[in-house]
């Protein structure tokens, strides 16, 4: 009974039906199933296609632009569970732009374990209002079901028996509407007694075993489940995998040799992106979690002492990093066995990219050479570099070599960075923006002071075009409001006051107080700081009443911490000696203000004396939210409730239906009760600001989803004819 067929990998079936036959023997798809972009298929192509063995999909099911497909009832008649281990943009079931789909027809679908449902832009799709999604998944409020034929009330959804005046299908209440539940005109929705929870029940309504999920052939027997709530092991459902088994992919138990085979298959394969599976916490998982390293004898993840080491041996003993691509080859390395030559002339978002790829390097066994790297402003992307051994040296016995770096202004932030150079000398020439004080500081910190000879550090070609600030600017006044920060600082005048061109104020959002001046900067225009140029103040002849320069920062975010510093802008003096001043980086938080409104309020009455309210926090809390205020007001009962004959056939119960989150314009149009429709004289009220805002948010949300969908599903054709689909970055 339990998963009678094979376990198949995730599939991406597109363009034509050829590969659909690979589903033939699959009981479980371990991954996602995407069927999409079939423009030439017709209804008759699907007539004899059926995959009755398919019981479960572990990730998500996505159907997108498959022409001619009118129902899924024959295609997947026994699909019972979609686990949603990995989701497609928060969704486990996505039916999007299926132009000919008339009904879902997944009449055995009993459980979507994680994630929600997105059914959108399906012009012919009916039988949506007849499905009670709350019986299938928990987070119904996150479902997004809009712009289908069902919205336009053009569907004549008839459940089994209705044509003959019978009600064969169970009815449930949603938003006060008591509706028969069915998937198609011939298939009811199976609704189990509430006590069965999600375990499922037999046709007679007897609950399945607590380890079952969705359905079973006999009650209270873990070997007779259709799918398992937790884990599957040798024909039965179990709560957890007993030794010597390991949990795999969140749904089944596997033995050590299974995990080992996966590990070796990948190790011996040349295919990029495969995983060398390991064992951790009784699970067979793709890789060790952060802070663990694999013990190669038993595949177990063991805690690293300190950061996990990854030794990278360089071919020919050295490697030149001349682009982000070449830096990516060292991603994750902690120890470099060899020497590094950095020669970066340009690129996008360099500082961040270099840190992402080289930021874990702690040790270089040879030398480090920074040569003609015009794009570099700082070496702080080597965030963890602590040791240069100098076991091999650059010609001239140099273990650190910096030549002709036109924009290099900082080596590291020496107040936070320790670097030891075991042997070898320093070489600095033609680094015009690198102040000598920065180089001398490196000599002290790295323990190389006294090793250098006279010409190793050029006095004339380092820092000759820099404003080597030797004075500290101090802030004299700081004031905040919810969207402004006012700063003033002590006056600064160079020996010749005409040399002061003004000040540069740098600021950026900084959630943590760990920012350095050169974070995120490179010479190609990337700069995470906002920079303001400020004119010098009027110079007073009275030294006692010098004007304090300042700036009012406007348009800031409430309740947000900013990192701020200011430095002088001075001209180069004739003697090639430049002056200047700079403040420390300070952190200032704007004040709190009123939060934006709570989002997506939902009200449901669960009894005659109770209303349950749910809402999401505001998008802009603008401070620490301590409590919410709920206001309510009793309203006069609708007189129609007393006047109606409730025995009238076909009468829909009048109800105040609540609007689910992200309700579309179309569904709002058709949410009016039939009494309003029949009047025909009422004009629609103008939209409120909140409605307009909601529609804008809705439109933006829809665009985001569509962009995501298009980015994921449209991939360039492969030249080789591979069978496995590329993994499309699910969430």
């Amino acid at each position: 009974h339990l998963y009678p067929g094979e376990v198949c990998p995730g599939m991406d079936i597109r363009n034509n039906l050829t590969r659909l036959h690979e589903l033939e023997n699959c009981s479980v798809i371990e991954g996602h199933l995407q069927i999409l972009l079939m423009f030439k298929t017709r209804p008759e192509d699907f007539r004899d296609l059926s995959f009755p063995k398919l019981i479960m999909i572990t990730d998500y099911l996505l159907l997108f632009r498959v022409y001619g497909l009118e129902s899924l009832k024959d295609l997947f008649p026994n699909l019972t569970v979609i686990r949603g281990s990995r989701l497609f943009f928060n969704y486990a079931l996505v039916i999007f732009e299926m132009v000919h789909l008339k009904e879902l027809g997944l009449y055995n679908l009993m459980n979507i374990t994680r994630g929600s449902v997105r059914i959108e832009k399906n012009n012919e799709l009916c039988y949506l209002a007849t499905i009670d999604w709350s019986r299938i998944l928990d987070s119904v409020e996150d479902n997004y079901i809009v712009l289908n034929k069902d919205d336009n009330e053009e569907c004549g959804d008839i459940c089994p028996g209705t044509a003959k005046g019978k009600t064969n299908c169970p009815a449930t209440v949603i938003n006060g509407q008591f509706v028969e539940r069915c998937w198609t005109h011939s298939h009811c929705q199976k609704v189990c007694p509430t006590i069965c929870k999600s375990h499922g029940c037999t046709a007679e309504g007897l609950c399945c075993h607590s380890e079952c999920l969705g359905n079973c052939s006999q009650p209270d027997d873990p070997t007779k489940c259709v799918a398992c709530r937790n884990f599957y092991l040798d024909g039965r459902c179990v709560e957890t995998c007993p030794p010597p088994y390991y949990h795999f992919q969140d749904w089944r138990c596997v033995n050590f040799s299974f995990c080992q085979d996966l590990h070796h298959k990948c190790k011996n394969s040349r295919r990029q992106g495969c995983h060398q599976y390991v064992i951790h916490n009784n699970k067979c998982i793709p890789e060790c979690p952060s802070g663990y390293t694999m013990n190669s004898s038993n595949l177990l993840c063991t805690p690293c002492l300190g950061p996990c080491p990854k030794v990278c041996h360089l071919l020919e003993g050295e490697k030149t990093i001349d682009s982000v691509t070449s830096a990516q080859e060292l991603r994750g390395c902690t120890v470099i066995n060899g020497s590094l030559i950095i020669n970066i002339r340009g690129g996008n978002n360099l500082a961040a990219e270099l840190e992402a790829n080289l930021g874990l390097i702690e040790e270089i066994s040879g030398y480090l050479k920074i040569r003609r790297s015009y794009a570099l402003v700082s070496l702080s992307f080597f965030r963890k570099l602590r040791l240069i051994r100098g076991e091999t040296l650059e010609i001239g016995n140099y273990s650190f070599y910096a030549l002709d770096n036109q924009n290099l202004r900082q080596l590291w932030d020496w107040s936070k960075h320790n670097l030891t150079i075991t042997q070898g000398k320093l070489f600095f020439h033609y680094n015009p923006k690198l102040c000598l004080s920065e180089i001398h500081k490196m000599e002290e910190v790295s323990g190389t002071k006294g090793r250098q000879e006279r010409n190793d550090i050029a006095l004339k070609t380092n820092g000759d075009q820099a404003s080597c600030e030797n004075e500290l600017l101090k802030f004299s006044y700081i004031r905040t409001s919810f969207d402004k920060i006012l700063l003033r600082w002590e006056p600064y005048w160079p020996p010749d006051f005409r040399d002061l061109l003004g000040f540069m104020l740098f600021y950026k959002e900084a959630p943590y107080q760990n920012v350095t001046e050169f974070d995120g900067q490179d010479a190609c225009g990337s700069n995470s700081w906002t920079v303001v140029d400020i004119d010098p103040p009027l110079r007073s002849n009275d030294p006692k009443s010098q004007n304090h320069p300042g700036w009012l920062m406007r348009g800031l975010k409430p309740w947000t911490q900013y990192a701020i510093f200011v430095k002088t802008l001075v001209t180069f003096s004739d003697e090639r000696r430049t002056y200047g001043a700079k403040s420390d980086i300070i952190y200032v938080q704007t004040d709190a203000t009123n939060p934006s409104v709570p989002l997506d309020p939902i009200s449901v009455s669960n009894s005659s004396s109770q209303i349950i309210l749910k809402w999401k926090p505001p998008s802009d809390p603008n401070g620490n939210i301590t409590h919410y205020l709920v206001f309510w007001e009793r309203q006069a009962e609708d007189s129609e409730l007393f006047e109606l004959d409730y025995c009238l056939k076909g009468l829909k119960l009048p109800s105040r239906t609540w609007s689910p989150p992200f309700e579309s314009e179309d569904s709002q149009k058709h949410n009016q009760s039939e009494y309003e429709d029949s009047a025909g004289e009422c004009c629609s009220c103008p939209k409120t600001d909140s409605q307009i805002l909601k529609e804008l948010e809705e439109s933006s949300f829809r665009k985001t989803f569509e962009d995501y969908l298009h980015n994921v599903v449209f991939v360039p054709r492969k030249t080789s004819s591979g069978t496995g689909a590329e993994d499309p970055r699910p969430s």
Epitope: Y477, R479, S481, L486, D535, P549, G550, L552
Partner: antibody, heavy 118, light 108 residues
Framework: EVQLLESGGGLVQPGGSLRLSCAAS????????MNWVRQAPGKGLEWVSS????????DVANSVVGRFTISRDNSKNTLYLQMNSLRAEDTAVYYC???????????WGQGTLVTVSS | QSVLTQPPSASGTPGQRVTISCSGS????????VNWYQQLPGTAPKLLIY???KRPSGVPDRFSGSKSGTSASLAISGLRSEDEADYYC?????????FGGGTKLTVL
Amino acid sequence: EVQLLESGGGLVQPGGSLRLSCAASGFTFSSYEMNWVRQAPGKGLEWVSSISSSSRYADVANSVVGRFTISRDNSKNTLYLQMNSLRAEDTAVYYCARGEWLDHFDYWGQGTLVTVSS
Amino acid sequence: QSVLTQPPSASGTPGQRVTISCSGSSSNIGNSAVNWYQQLPGTAPKLLIYDNNKRPSGVPDRFSGSKSGTSASLAISGLRSEDEADYYCQVWDSGTAVFGGGTKLTVL
């Protein structure tokens, strides 16, 4: 009716000190930022100092920094300006004015004259 | 020397329209709302216009304000003898209140 009444002005020698007061009534004093503005004889208006409603922020003009201190006592609905190391150029009529930060001064007192002369 | 420049004097006959200018820079008028004050002889200043063009209650609609770029102006139409006074513009510059030098309006 909003009323602001300054007091404490007078004749003082250079280098001397003086403390001005401003008694407020007709509004919730503790909710408003308060300011001192001065006007030298025959000259224009010059902002001197401001203090926020809770006294969290106190600001003074560059010309008086280090010599003048603004303070307030919300329980007494009174604003103060402590003036030390007075100079001849501090001679002026000193007005107390109500006005929020980065906003306008909506109510003014009648002013008190401070004369610094030997 | 004020950072906001006003003409020292202006004049007009009763019933005439008079305009007083106030010129500054991008860091003050360009970055702040302009307020105008009237100071009748021997009295304290009084708020006349705030936020560039708004009038407090009690101020006649003969007084109007405007701002463009780094300059602002105060217009008085239907001039009356009781309008004879000093007029000051005021803005905020880096958190400091700054006044113009003042314009003495004479009603001929």
